[in-house]
């Protein structure tokens, strides 16, 4: 025998108190699938959270973060304070990156500059708190006489 509740569409619940008829979800609640025996409470985007998508009878609300904060976690479950480029967020707030590290975003941690010498390359542009170093050709490529390009032979003058 088919469960009568399976006929209840999204946006309703199967009301056992009313002979298993399909009742619409109460305000501020939703059911995203059919056949549910209760609706779910809508997520409320309060405080640092901002409503990105309103709750409807068939789908939950979606939140993002107010300016100066960014989402963390699945479905923006947390909002974390932004920092400036060249900083990272610590327990005591935003702190400048230590020498030898950088952060080119408003979130995340300071990361060490690339060690060019590990790849046998030289530093072309020094790193800053906001930017990684730029590695250039290897020192051997820059030494005199090491060039693989043969200079053109001098042109002979006519008649010689």
């Amino acid at each position: 025998l088919q469960d009568p509740c399976s006929n209840c569409p999204a946006g309703t619940f199967c009301d056992n108190n009313r002979n298993q008829i399909c009742s619409p979800c109460p305000p501020n609640s939703f059911s995203s699938a059919g056949g549910q025996r209760t609706c779910d409470i809508c997520r409320q985007c309060k405080g640092v959270f901002r409503t990105r998508k309103e709750c409807s009878s068939t789908s939950n609300a979606e939140c993002d973060c107010t300016p100066g904060f960014h989402c963390l976690g699945a479905g923006c479950s947390m909002c974390e304070q932004d920092c400036k480029q060249g900083q990272e967020l610590t327990k005591k707030g935003c702190k400048d990156c230590c020498f030898g590290t950088f952060n080119d975003q408003k979130r995340g941690i300071c990361r060490p500059w690339t060690n060019c010498s590990l790849d046998g390359k030289s530093v072309l542009v020094n790193g800053t708190k906001e930017r990684d170093v730029v590695c250039g050709p290897s020192p051997a490529d820059l030494s005199p006489g090491a060039s693989s390009v043969t200079p053109p032979a001098p042109a002979r003058e006519p008649g010689h």
Epitope: N17, P26, S29, T38, C39, D40, I41
Partner: nanobody
Framework: EVQLLESGGGLVQPGGSLRLSCAAS????????VGWVRQAPGKGLEWVSA????????YYAESVKGRFTISRDNAKNTLYLQMSSLRAEDTAVYYC???????????????RGQGTQVTVSS
């Protein structure tokens, strides 16, 4: 035991007004999320209005916004629905409803009363 007793319905001409009452017992209307649902002839239930978050916010269906007003009298433990500028499409049985929050996070509602019939016709 939770009981809800609706009254105040009747026959009214288009553009007219009615005030529905819901006398509650077995719970306190000021401490619960409560509202009104209706069922038009041959149609399913529809939420009309509710007082949510213990009075922190009110809800109105788009079809009744600006025409219906929900309120309550805590001393009388009674919920009201003031209906004005009534239209033929407001014809329905109106039920008082108590929103029920379940331990597992689910939401349903009780409509224990018999409802009160509102007929809008000339």
């Amino acid at each position: 035991e939770v009981q809800l007793l609706e009254s105040g319905g009747g026959l009214v001409q288009p553009g007219g007004s009615l005030r529905l009452s819901c006398a509650a017992s077995g719970f306190t209307v000021s401490a619960e999320d409560v509202g009104w649902v209706r069922q038009a002839p041959g149609k399913g239930l529809e939420w009309v209005s509710a007082i949510l978050d213990r009075g922190g916010s009110t809800y109105y269906a788009e079809s009744v916004k600006g025409r219906f007003t929900i309120s309550r009298d805590n001393a009388k433990n009674t919920l009201y629905l003031q209906m004005s500028s009534l239209r033929a499409e407001d014809t329905a049985v109106y039920y008082c409803a108590r929103v029920v929050y379940h331990a597992g996070g689910g939401v349903t509602y009780d409509t224990r009363g018999q409802g009160t019939q509102v007929t809008v016709s000339s």
